[in-house]
C-alpha cells in the first residue's frame, strides 16, 4: 500500500550542532530501511544532505541532523522521501525553534548557613549565542513524598541555586533535576537532566560540615530564610509549563 | 600550488557552440564550488555560473540561462562551460575561478581565492 | 539582483598617499554577525583578477597589510594606505551572498 504521513515533522535545534526532526507515519514503518529525510541550507553552494531516521516507536520516525553553528538567518528545505515518493515538503529555521541543549552534572553540596548548594554546568560554550540566554528551573521532590515537591525558576545568570535545608523535612531523602530555555530565542524547555539525590540531614549540621560553623540565621523561621535566597521559588503544577511547539 | 588552467576558446559564429574547460591542480577540488566569470573588451567583470563542489547545484546568469551549462568531473579535477546558441555579446575572456567551501553544511567563504589565466572566446560572422 | 555601485569610477593619488573606494549594495550583505558577503579584487593591466579582502575585511592570503576592507550591511569601503606603484589597476567588489553574483562597475586606480 502507499506510504502516508499522519503527524508531519515537527523538528527542533538546539542551536549548535544538531537538529531533531520527528514524525509520525500512519502505520508501522522500519523508518530506517523505508525513509529519508533530505535538507538543504538556503545558501549559494550548498550541497544536499541526507539524514536516515530511526524508529522512536512502531511508526514514530526520528532524524538527527548535524548542522553547523546556527545562526539566525539560516532556513533549511526539508523533504521527506519513501524512496522516489515524495511524502512532505516543508522548511525549518533553526532560530526559530530552539530547543537548548540538557544542563550537564548537576552536584549538591552542603553549603554556609544550613543551606544546599546546587551546582550544574551550562550546556553551551561561553561563544554560543545561547550561554548567555538560559534560565533553568530546578524540580525539587522527596523521593518518599509524591506532594513534597518544590519548583525553582533561576533566572540570574549563574548555573546554581541556593536551597535552605529547613524547607525541607529532615531526615528525607530528596531528588533534583534541572532544564532549561532561552527566552530570547522563545525556545521549548530543554529535556531534565538526569537526577541527583541526597539525604537532607542537617543535626548535627556542624559534623556533616566537618566544622562547627556560627550561623547568624539560626533565629529566622522558613520565611526568613527565603528572603535571603538567589532563587525565586515557585510551587506550582509542571502540567501548566508544558511547551509544545510545532 | 594552487593552480586553474583554461582552455576551449575560439572564434565561432552566431549561433555556435564551445566548451571550455578548467583544469584544477594543488587543492582538494572536489570540496569546493567552481565559478565562471567573464570580462568583454574593455568591460568590467561579469559572473557567468557556479557549481557546487559535488555537483548537485548549479546557478546561472540570467544572459546565458537556458543556452549555456556548468558541469564538473571531479576525477578529472575538471570544470566545464558548455556555451550553445551563442550570441555576439557572448565576446569576453571567460575566467575560471574557486569559489567556496562546500563541503560542510554551510559553505565556508573565501571570495573567488583563485582565478585562471582566461581563454578568450570571439562570436562573430 | 543585487546592485552594486562604486564610487568613485577612476582615481588618482600620489605615492604613499591613501586611496579609498566605496561600495554600495542595493540589499544588505549581512548574513549574520560579522559575515558581510563583499569582496574586493584588483586586476592589473593585462592580467587575470586577484582576490584583495573577502567577507567584508579579511585579507585575502599573501596580500599586505596595506589593503584593509571596512564597513556593514550595504555601505563598505577599501582603503589602500601608502599606495606604491604595483597598486595600479582596476578594483571591483562583488557580493558573493546570492545568486547571480554581481560585481561593481570598477574603480580604475592611477599612480601620479
Known amino acids: 500500500g502507499s506510504v502516508k504521513v499522519l503527524h508531519e515533522p515537527s523538528c527542533f535545534s538546539d542551536y549548535i550542532s544538531t537538529s531533531v526532526c520527528q514524525w509520525k507515519m500512519d502505520h508501522p514503518t522500519n523508518c530506517s530501511a523505508e525513509l529519508r529525510l533530505s535538507y538543504q541550507l538556503d545558501f549559494m553552494g550548498s550541497e544536499n544532505h541526507t539524514c536516515v531516521p530511526e524508529n522512536r516507536e512502531d511508526s514514530v520516525c526520528v532524524c538527527s541532523m548535524p548542522i553547523d553553528d546556527a545562526v539566525e538567518a539560516d532556513v533549511y528545505q526539508l523533504d521527506l522521501w519513501a524512496g522516489q515518493q515524495l511524502l512532505w515538503s516543508g522548511s525549518f529555521q533553526p532560530s526559530k525553534h530552539v530547543k537548548p541543549r540538557t544542563p550537564g552534572n548537576l552536584t549538591v553540596h552542603p553549603n554556609i548557613s544550613h543551606t544546599w548548594l546546587l551546582m550544574w554546568t551550562n550546556p553551551y560554550p561561553t561563544e554560543n549565542h545561547l550561554h548567555s540566554e538560559l534560565t533553568y528551573m530546578v524540580n525539587v521532590s522527596n523521593d518518599n513524598d509524591p506532594e513534597d515537591f518544590k519548583v525553582y525558576n533561576v533566572t540570574y545568570m549563574g548555573p546554581t541555586l541556593r536551597l535552605a535545608a529547613s524547607t525541607l523535612k529532615s531526615g528525607a531523602s530528596y531528588s533534583a533535576r534541572v532544564r532549561a530555555w532561552a527566552q530570547t530565542y522563545n525556545s521549548t524547555w530543554s529535556d531534565w537532566s538526569p537526577s541527583t539525590t541526597w539525604l537532607n540531614y542537617y543535626e548535627p549540621w556542624e559534623q556533616h560540615l566537618g566544622k562547627p560553623i556560627p550561623n547568624p540565621l539560626l533565629g529566622l523561621d522558613s520565611t526568613g530564610l527565603n528572603d535571603i535566597f538567589e532563587a525565586q521559588k515557585i510551587e506550582w503544577h509542571e502540567h501548566h509549563h508544558h511547551h509544545h511547539h510545532h | 600550488e594552487v593552480q586553474l588552467v583554461e582552455s576551449g576558446g575560439d572564434l565561432v559564429k552566431p549561433g555556435g557552440s564551445l566548451r571550455l574547460s578548467c583544469v584544477a591542480s594543488?587543492?582538494?577540488?572536489?570540496?569546493?564550488?567552481m565559478t565562471w566569470v567573464r570580462q568583454a573588451p574593455g568591460k568590467g567583470l561579469q559572473w557567468v555560473s557556479m557549481i557546487s563542489g559535488s555537483g548537485g547545484k548549479t546557478y546561472y546568469a540570467d544572459a546565458v540561462k537556458g543556452r549555456f551549462t556548468i558541469s564538473r568531473d571531479n576525477a578529472k579535477n575538471t570544470l566545464y562551460l558548455q556555451m550553445n546558441s551563442l550570441r555576439a555579446e557572448d565576446t569576453a575572456v571567460y575566467y575560471c575561478?574557486?569559489?567556496?567551501?562546500?563541503?560542510?553544511?554551510?559553505?565556508?567563504?573565501?571570495?573567488?581565492?583563485?582565478w585562471g589565466q582566461g581563454t578568450l572566446v570571439t562570436v562573430s560572422s | 539582483d543585487i546592485v552594486m555601485t562604486q564610487t568613485p569610477l577612476s582615481l588618482s593619488v600620489s605615492p604613499g598617499e591613501t586611496a579609498s573606494i566605496s561600495c554600495r549594495s542595493s540589499q544588505s550583505l549581512l548574513y549574520s554577525i560579522g559575515y558581510n558577503y563583499l569582496d574586493w579584487y584588483l586586476q592589473k593591466p593585462g592580467q587575470s583578477p586577484q582576490g584583495l579582502i573577502y567577507?567584508?575585511?579579511k585579507r585575502a592570503s599573501g596580500v599586505p597589510d596595506r589593503f584593509s576592507g571596512s564597513g556593514s550591511g550595504t555601505d563598505f569601503t577599501l582603503r589602500i594606505s601608502r599606495v606604491e606603484a604595483n597598486d595600479t589597476g582596476v578594483y571591483y567588489c562583488?557580493?558573493?551572498?546570492?545568486?547571480?553574483?554581481?560585481f561593481g562597475q570598477g574603480t580604475k586606480l592611477e599612480i601620479k
Open positions: 567577507l567584508g575585511s
Open positions: 575561478a574557486v569559489d567556496r567551501l562546500t563541503k560542510t553544511i554551510r559553505p565556508q567563504y573565501y571570495g573567488l581565492w583563485v
Open positions: 562583488m557580493q558573493g551572498l546570492q545568486s547571480p553574483l554581481t
Open positions: 594543488g587543492f582538494t577540488f572536489r570540496d569546493y564550488a
